[in-house]
């Protein structure tokens, strides 16, 4: 399961996707879209 960064800090538990608040500004990943700060 993947770990995605997301600056609103919510978690999608059923997919085990955890979004963290830090490092969003670094944009180290591809923008997921239709969310806040999510990159992967």
């Amino acid at each position: 399961d993947a770990e995605f960064r997301h600056d609103s800090g919510y978690e999608v538990h059923h997919q085990k996707l955890v979004f963290f608040a830090e490092d969003v500004g670094s944009n180290k990943g591809a923008i997921i879209g239709l969310m806040v700060g999510g990159v992967v």
Epitope: A2, D7, S8, G9, Y10, V12, H14, Q15, L17, N27, G29, A30, I31, I32, G33, L34, M35, V36, G37, G38, V39, V40
Partner: antibody, heavy 121, light 111 residues
Framework: QVQLVQSGAEVKKPGASVKVSCKAS????????IHWVRQAPGQGLEWMGF????????NYNQKFKGRVTMTRDTSTSTVYMELSSLRSEDTAVYYC??????????????WGQGTLVTVSS | DIVMTQSPDSLAVSLGERATINCRAS??????????LNWYQQKPGQPPKLLIY???KQGTGVPDRFSGSGSGTDFTLTISSLQAEDVAVYYC?????????FGGGTKVEIK
């Protein structure tokens, strides 16, 4: 300008696999995930999943788990969606798409033209 | 998974009149004061087009006659003055959780 150009229509037999391509241009390929959405004839929209051209990580709709694989080729800025064990219910137009995040100064979407996959014996 | 339900299935409205489409989510699509609810327009033979994101914000280049409202589980798309070019199917979609999900669509026609 941003463009997503998909491969042509396919006709497949039940049990076969299909691989649809989506070639991106007009932006830095690795900066946006590519999503796949399908639409059966006369029906609604169904999200299949996405893949990251940056990391190669994919996330799939559990409905398709085990049957769908999304990959990318950064050398050609192309994303692929492969669906296996095809059945008649998989007959649909398959779209690739790119979306902005809410926190951009602007938010819009870009879609491929669609690829019709017909599953018939 | 979050289930999105739209009503009505179809709607016939006179030119210049208001069209209202409803969307209900099986659970809240809000998080941190943001509603992760989007609306799309799809015309025959074309891919969908994003109209409204985050429940109330207009997508790039979307005419002002399209507006969105609501929060939590209940949302509305309003076309304030229907134009001939607005004939299409409209879909709501949640992007709070994977898998993203769409409503069944509402077909808007001219009366």
């Amino acid at each position: 300008q941003v463009q997503l150009v998909q491969s042509g229509a396919e006709v497949k037999k039940p049990g076969a696999s299909v691989k649809v391509s989506c070639k991106a241009s007009g932006y830095t390929f690795t900066t946006y995930a590519i999503h796949w959405v399908r639409q059966a004839p006369g029906q609604g929209l169904e999200w299949m999943g996405f893949t990251s051209p940056y990391s190669g990580v994919s996330n799939y709709n559990q409905k398709f788990k085990g049957r769908v694989t999304m990959t990318r080729d950064t050398s050609t800025s192309t994303v692929y969606m492969e669906l296996s064990s095809l059945r008649s219910e998989d007959t649909a137009v398959y779209y690739c798409a790119r979306f902005d995040n809410y926190d951009r100064g602007y938010v819009r979407d870009y879609w491929g033209q669609g690829t019709l996959v017909t599953v018939s014996s | 998974d979050i289930v999105m339900t739209q009503s009505p299935d179809s709607l016939a409205v006179s030119l210049g009149e208001r069209a209202t489409i409803n969307c209900r989510a099986s659970e809240s699509v809000d998080n941190d004061r943001i509603s992760f609810l989007n609306w799309y327009q799809q015309k025959p033979g074309q891919p969908p087009k994003l109209l409204i994101y985050a429940a109330t914000k207009q997508g790039t280049g979307v005419p002002d006659r399209f507006s969105g409202s609501g929060s939590g589980t209940d949302f509305t798309l309003t076309i304030s003055s229907l134009q001939a070019e607005d004939v299409a199917v409209y879909y709501c979609q949640q992007s709070k959780e994977f898998p993203w999900s769409f409503g069944g669509g509402t077909k808007v026609e001219i009366k």
